[in-house]
């Protein structure tokens, strides 16, 4: 029960952390101008990895996309990358966890295939987690070195001609977002990969072995928690580790209405 | 058509303040600033500031804070402007003029209003 | 504030003729965003109140006569009027939309012979 608790979280918690991915992604927010300190404009700016923005005072909005790749620089484009490659694998870990969550029934999957799965969804969404972070952290520092080089500049003018205000930007809303959303499938991933031990059945764990004494019968599981003691010969039946592992009459039951999605 | 309509005059004595008017129609009022702008016999324009009437946002020049208010009343889709304890030099034509909407420049002025202020 | 400055202070033409005032500011009304000069020039005829002739440095304002032109980036620009009419007579007005506060040129006086 826990380990599948464990999963659906993991997978529930990724899917989120995705999503956010892919809306920072789109997000026009990555940088925004600096207001604090700075010659007040009538226009507001910020900019995302795709296009840039000018909102006027009157609330008209106009953006211009990048219509170049060669022209853009070099940490855009790898920030850009970054970023997709995040999604791509965070897209592909969710349809590989999707057929490994275990309150799903697909033909007759095998637990440890589901295990494999779970992990190789799991190792998925954290370096689909680290790709957003990383990319987000780029662009963050992008920003703070365009920051006070700009601001160096706005406090040497140019001797007397005419001196240009630059708009400096700040940290936009995207990036929060890239932040916290990275950090979830980070933590959807490493849920996947504890649940991927739980999984994992040992050679043992569907074989109960019955070792017969005089008087009593000893049901003993080795790869279990418990050794459950009866008399009788009930022990066929017996439900000896309520943790995942079941005794061979019970891996066989009937669909339930959460079998399926 | 859009529409700005000031009252033509404010006679005021030296110290004393004044409201002047701009009702505006032909338009949705609270959809655009409103912006007011001096002009003294003979001499240039002085931006004084601008209102937002939906939420009453507004940017002044610093020149003018304090000594101008400005105030829209969103039922009569009117907007005011307010100077206070006004010297002689006070004396010239006050416009209101709407924002555009693409830029934020002036698209509509009102006729102004001569404030004369005399003793 | 933004000084816009303005030349010639007036001059006086014959209709027909080709005019041009300029307007300097003191600081850049470029917006890297849209690329964008956030510079309007007004009309303003005896005992009228202005009149928006061109945005954002060189967008003509609806209704305005395809004879007024405006140019310019950075910190300079200017008002060309191809071929001047007699109703052309007014005071030109440069104004910094961009930097609050806005501010307004010292105008340029055109009288026609």
């Known amino acids: 029960m826990a380990v599948t608790a464990c999963q659906g979280l993991g997978f529930v918690v990724s899917l989120i952390g995705i999503a956010g991915i892919i809306a920072a992604t789109c997000m026009d927010q990555w940088s925004t101008q600096d207001l604090y300190n700075n010659p007040v404009t009538a226009v507001f700016n910020y900019q995302g990895l795709w296009r840039s923005c000018v909102r006027e005072s009157s609330g008209f909005t106009e953006c211009r996309g990048y219509f170049t790749l060669l022209g853009l620089p070099a940490m855009l484009q790898a920030v850009r990358a970054l970023m997709i490659v995040g999604i791509v694998l965070g897209a592909i870990g969710l349809l590989v966890s999707i057929f490994a969550l275990k309150c799903i029934r697909i033909g007759s999957m095998e637990d440890s295939a589901k295990a494999n799965m779970t992990l190789t969804s799991g190792i998925m969404f954290i370096v689909s987690g680290l790709c957003a972070i990383a990319g987000v952290s780029v662009f963050a520092n992008m920003l703070v070195t365009n920051f006070w080089m700009s601001t160096a500049n706005m406090y040497t003018g140019m001797g007397g001609m005419v001196q240009t205000v630059q708009t400096r930007y700040t940290f936009g809303a995207a990036l929060f977002v890239g932040w916290v959303a990275g950090g979830l499938t980070l933590i959807g991933g490493v849920m996947m990969c504890i649940a991927c031990r739980g999984l994992a059945p040992e050679e043992t764990n569907y074989k109960a072995v019955s070792y017969h004494a005089s008087g009593h019968s000893v049901a003993y599981k080795p790869g279990g928690f418990k050794a459950s003691t009866g008399f009788g010969s009930n022990t066929k039946n017996k439900k000896i580790y309520d943790g995942g592992a079941r005794t061979e009459d019970e891996v066989q039951s009937y669909p339930s209405k959460h079998d399926y999605v | 058509q859009v529409q700005l309509q000031q009252p033509g005059t404010e006679l005021v004595k030296p110290g004393a303040s004044v409201k002047v008017s701009c009702k505006a129609s032909?338009?949705?009022?609270?959809?655009?600033?409103m912006h007011w702008v001096k002009q003294r016999p003979g001499q240039g324009l002085e931006w004084i500031g601008r209102?937002?009437?939906?939420?009453?946002?507004?940017n002044y020049n610093q020149k003018f804070k304090g000594k101008a208010t400005l105030t829209v009343d969103k039922s009569s889709d009117t907007a005011y402007m307010q100077l206070n304890s006004l010297p002689s030099e006070d004396s010239a034509v006050y416009y209101c003029?709407?924002?555009?909407?693409?830029?934020?420049?002036?698209?509509?002025w009102g006729q102004g209003t001569l404030v004369t202020v005399s003793a | 504030d933004i000084v816009m400055t303005q030349s010639p202070s007036s001059l006086t033409v014959t209709a027909g003729e080709k005019v041009t005032m300029t307007c300097k500011s003191s600081?850049?009304?470029?917006?890297?965003?849209?690329?964008?000069?956030?510079v309007t020039w007004y009309q303003q005829k005896p005992g009228q109140p202005p009149k928006l002739l061109i945005y954002?440095?060189?967008t003509r304002e609806s209704g305005v006569p395809d004879r007024f032109t405006g140019s310019g980036s950075g910190t300079d620009f200017t008002l060309t009027i191809s071929s001047v009419q007699a109703e052309d007579l007014a005071v030109y007005y440069c104004?910094?939309?961009?930097?609050?506060?806005?501010?307004f040129g010292s105008g340029t006086k055109l009288e026609i012979r």
């Open positions: 003029a709407m924002g555009a909407y693409f830029s934020n420049s002036f698209a509509y």
């Open positions: 600081q850049t009304l470029l917006n890297r965003g849209n690329q964008k000069n956030y």
């Open positions: 032909g338009y949705t009022f609270t959809s655009y600033w």
């Open positions: 954002w440095a060189s």
């Open positions: 104004q910094n939309d961009y930097f609050f506060p806005f501010t």
């Open positions: 209102i937002r009437p939906s939420d009453s946002d507004s």
